[in-house]
């Protein structure tokens, strides 16, 4: 599989936003790339979001996606929003070179995202 690098640990902001870079070593000159973020909790793997982009163009997730991102060369900057403490887990970056053939696939080792729910503000008298 292709080599895919991502940070081991990221701490989400108090607003529930986490960002990390997913970088892949492309064997050749792909023009169409698909990036998928997977969440692994226990032995279950679920898809968080996915986007296909043409090299040189912006990364576009679906309108209702909790992910946004930008791409630059073989690097994708991913941001996941709306995270809560229960969303803490391992987030895996999957990269597929879709076109031109051949097909290449790479899976990162995952980024452990820690999310801490903010303490509610105390009532003021």
């Amino acid at each position: 599989a292709m080599h895919v690098a991502q940070p081991a640990v990221v701490l989400a902001s108090s607003r529930g936003i986490a960002s990390f870079v997913c970088e892949y070593a492309s064997p050749g000159k792909a023009t169409e790339v698909r990036v998928t973020v997977l969440r692994q909790a226990d032995s279950q793997v679920t898809e968080v979001c996915a986007a296909t982009y043409m090299m040189g163009n912006e990364l576009t997730f679906l309108d209702d996606s909790i992910c946004t991102g930008t791409s630059s060369g073989n690097q994708v900057n991913l941001t996941i929003q709306g995270l809560r403490a229960m969303d803490t887990g391992l987030y895996i970056c999957k990269v597929e070179l879709m076109y031109p053939p051949p097909y290449y696939l790479g899976i990162g080792n995952g980024t452990q995202i820690y999310v801490i729910d903010p303490e509610p503000c105390p009532d003021s008298d």
């Epitope: 599989a1 080599h3 070593a25 492309s26 064997p27 050749g28 000159k29 997977l38 793997v45 895996i92 999957k94 597929e96 879709m98 053939p101 051949p102 097909y103 290449y104 696939l105 899976i107």
Partner: antibody, heavy 115, light 107 residues
């Protein structure tokens, strides 16, 4: 048009050696990982070896059945990949295919190991 | 190495039938699965890549599905020219092994 043309197959005695070649055209050879796959008579497809390209430092990988006996190599200036086969056994008989990361395949070359 | 279990090993179906072939892997391969068709005397032909994507020039009768460890190749309406042996392959591993194959015949 993409073409992969294998050559070098033939009859060889057990314990002998043979070198297969695969000439590629119609695509950017240096951008691709190259593989050898075989099909023995009456058996299924068996992946044998892979050589990656320059961004991957020409890393090589082998199946357990051929490791230590077969060597894969490539010459990007000639758009060619090779399989050096040593210490051949009768069970190495089959049709050998080269493939550009399994998207493009050659027509195959027959290797027969027999005394 | 990741083990590939393909089933059935052979099947016979009628023209127009919907045909399903399955492939199970010993561990999660994250959709890194290809399907091939091999006809006697011909080179293998890539049908499906990345579990669900139809390769260029392949009939839309063929489709792939699955994730994790369980994958399926479906032929929506079997045609005489589909007689062949079909193989799955894991393309995630450094040792991209094939399934044992499914020989498909027409009744």
């Amino acid at each position: 048009e993409v073409q992969l043309v294998e050559s070098g197959g033939g009859l060889v005695q057990p314990g002998g050696s043979i070198r297969l070649s695969c000439a590629a055209s119609g695509f950017t050879f240096s951008d691709n990982w190259m593989n050898w796959v075989r099909q023995a008579p009456g058996k299924g497809l068996e992946w044998l070896a892979q050589i990656r390209n320059k961004p991957y430092n020409y890393e090589t990988y082998y199946s357990a059945s051929v490791k230590g006996r077969f060597t894969i190599s490539r010459d990007d200036s000639k758009n060619s990949v090779y399989l050096q086969m040593n210490s051949l056994k009768t069970e190495d008989t089959g049709v050998y295919y080269c493939t550009a990361q399994f998207a493009y395949w050659g027509q195959g070359t027959l290797v027969t190991v027999s005394s | 190495d990741i083990q590939m279990t393909q089933s059935p090993s052979s099947l016979s179906a009628s023209v127009g039938d919907r045909v399903t072939i399955t492939c199970r892997t010993s561990e999660n391969i994250y959709g890194g699965l290809n399907w091939y068709q091999r006809k006697p005397g011909k080179s293998p032909k890539l049908l499906i890549y990345g579990a669900t994507n139809l390769a260029s020039g392949v009939s839309s009768r063929f489709s792939g599905s699955g994730s994790g460890t369980d994958y399926t190749l479906t032929i929506s309406s079997l045609q005489p020219e589909d007689v062949a042996t079909y193989y799955c392959q894991n393309v995630l591993s450094r040792h991209p092994g094939f399934g044992s194959g499914t020989k498909l015949e027409i009744k």
